[in-house]
């Protein structure tokens, strides 16, 4: 049983990486002297209380930065936010903290991250690039929901 977060790096199919800019995650083409974020992820320890066959429920944070990804409604729209939160505090909670949880599914080298709080909504980046990460229901050409996750050991 793993009870420390794993670290990983993420890029999309267009080789864009996640960068932290003004407390917002954006996807940009990888360049020299750029510092992509390192992701911290840990599986929910209450996996038996969540939906089966939807993916591995994980908490997603930014390694070393005490920031975690969460989903919350703004008006009627689920949005992706970064919150100041220790990922291990989420992990240790007596119940799944759904707003911070994502179903991680892998198909070959591609990973998707679906909100547990808002089923059917996925972490995405606009195909244009240089844009903030968002949540989307539309798995079409306008947004990329497939990411490459490389674990760092």
């Amino acid at each position: 049983k793993i009870d420390t977060p794993q670290r990983g790096s993420i890029q999309d199919i267009n080789h864009r990486v996640w960068v932290l800019q003004d407390q917002t995650l954006i996807a940009v083409p990888r360049k020299d002297r750029m510092s992509p974020v390192t992701i911290a992820l840990i599986s929910c320890r209450h996996v038996e209380t969540l939906e089966k066959d939807r993916g591995n429920p994980i908490y997603l944070g930014l390694n070393g930065l005490n920031l975690c990804l969460m989903c919350a409604k703004v008006g009627d729209q689920p949005t992706l936010q970064l919150k100041e939160k220790d990922i291990m505090d989420l992990y240790n909670q007596p119940e799944p903290v759904k707003s911070f949880l994502f179903y991680h599914s892998q198909s070959g080298r591609n990973s998707t991250f679906e909100s547990v709080a808002f089923p059917g909504w996925f972490i995405a980046v606009s195909s244009e690039g240089g844009c903030p990460l968002i949540l989307t229901q539309e798995l079409g050409k306008a947004n990329t929901t497939d990411f490459g996750l490389t674990m760092l050991f």
């Epitope: 209450h46 038996e48 209380t49 909670q93 007596p94 119940e95 903290v97 759904k98 707003s99």
Partner: antibody
Framework: QVQLVQSGAEVKKPGASVKVSCKAS????????IYWVRQAPGQGLEWIGR????????RYDPKFQGKATLTTDTSTSTAYLELSSLRSEDTAVYYC??????????????WGQGTLVTVSS | QAVVTQEPSLTVSPGGTVTLTCRSS?????????ANWVQEKPGQLFTGLIG???DRAPGVPARFSGSLLGGKAALTLSGAQPEDEADYFC?????????FGGGTKLTVL
């Protein structure tokens, strides 16, 4: 405003079953966990179990496994507790409560008014 | 299964300070037990006071605080008011299940 309104008092014979309801209003029942707790006369509180209304998954105190069944009907925002094979020791006030995450921790923030179940021959 | 024990009754003077405790039969209470405290006033609904050992629920007066004290979970009431007269219950998490204490009847006299 947030409210949990429970069904009325019940009198049952030993061996019978009872189903207590808890109707939620002022919030989306699928956004939280509903807990069930009981208080026998002159006793403390006893946790029965909880349900995640969004997906229907449950947890029970080992003592109530097989005795209690938790369900929800999200279309009517109602949670249910069904107790089977009732005995006199099941005479108690049964409460539903919302167990919600608010920024840093889970809290029991709202409770139903309680439903008295009396088991008597 | 674990047994959670509270003082059956305590008395505090108005404006005074009192500490209610919650002991576990399995040993010292830790932050991993995520202590919760709830209040029941006569004729009123239960209300949550504390979650996660020391996090006050939204809207709860600052005179209520949660902590760990000598291997027990503690609820401290500083500057007791007459309206704080009530029954107080703690609950501790043990892995995947929750155990309540027997409750403390607090009198403000």
């Amino acid at each position: 405003q947030v409210q949990l309104v429970q069904s009325g008092a019940e009198v049952k014979k030993p061996g019978a079953s009872v189903k207590v309801s808890c109707k939620a209003s002022g919030f989306n029942i699928k956004d939280t966990y509903i807990y069930w707790v009981r208080q026998a006369p002159g006793q403390g509180l006893e946790w029965i179990g909880r349900i995640d209304p969004a997906i229907g998954t449950t947890r029970y105190d080992p003592k109530f496994q097989g005795k209690a069944t938790l369900t929800t009907d999200t279309s009517t925002s109602t949670a249910y507790l069904e107790l089977s094979s009732l005995r006199s020791e099941d005479t108690a006030v049964y409460y539903c409560a919302r167990y919600d995450y608010s920024g840093s921790s889970f809290y029991f923030d709202y409770w139903g008014q309680g439903t008295l179940v009396t088991v008597s021959s | 299964q674990a047994v959670v024990t509270q003082e059956p009754s305590l008395t505090v003077s108005p404006g005074g300070t009192v500490t209610l405790t919650c002991r576990s039969s399995t040993g010292a209470v830790t932050t991993s037990n995520y202590a919760n405290w709830v209040q029941e006033k006569p004729g009123q609904l239960f209300t949550g006071l504390i979650g996660g050992t020391n996090d006050r629920a939204p809207g709860v007066p600052a005179r209520f605080s949660g902590s760990l004290l000598g291997g027990k979970a503690a609820l401290t009431l500083s500057g007791a008011q007459p309206e704080d007269e009530a029954d107080y219950f703690c609950a501790l998490w043990y892995s995947n299940h929750l155990v309540f204490g027997g409750g403390t009847k607090l009198t403000v006299l």
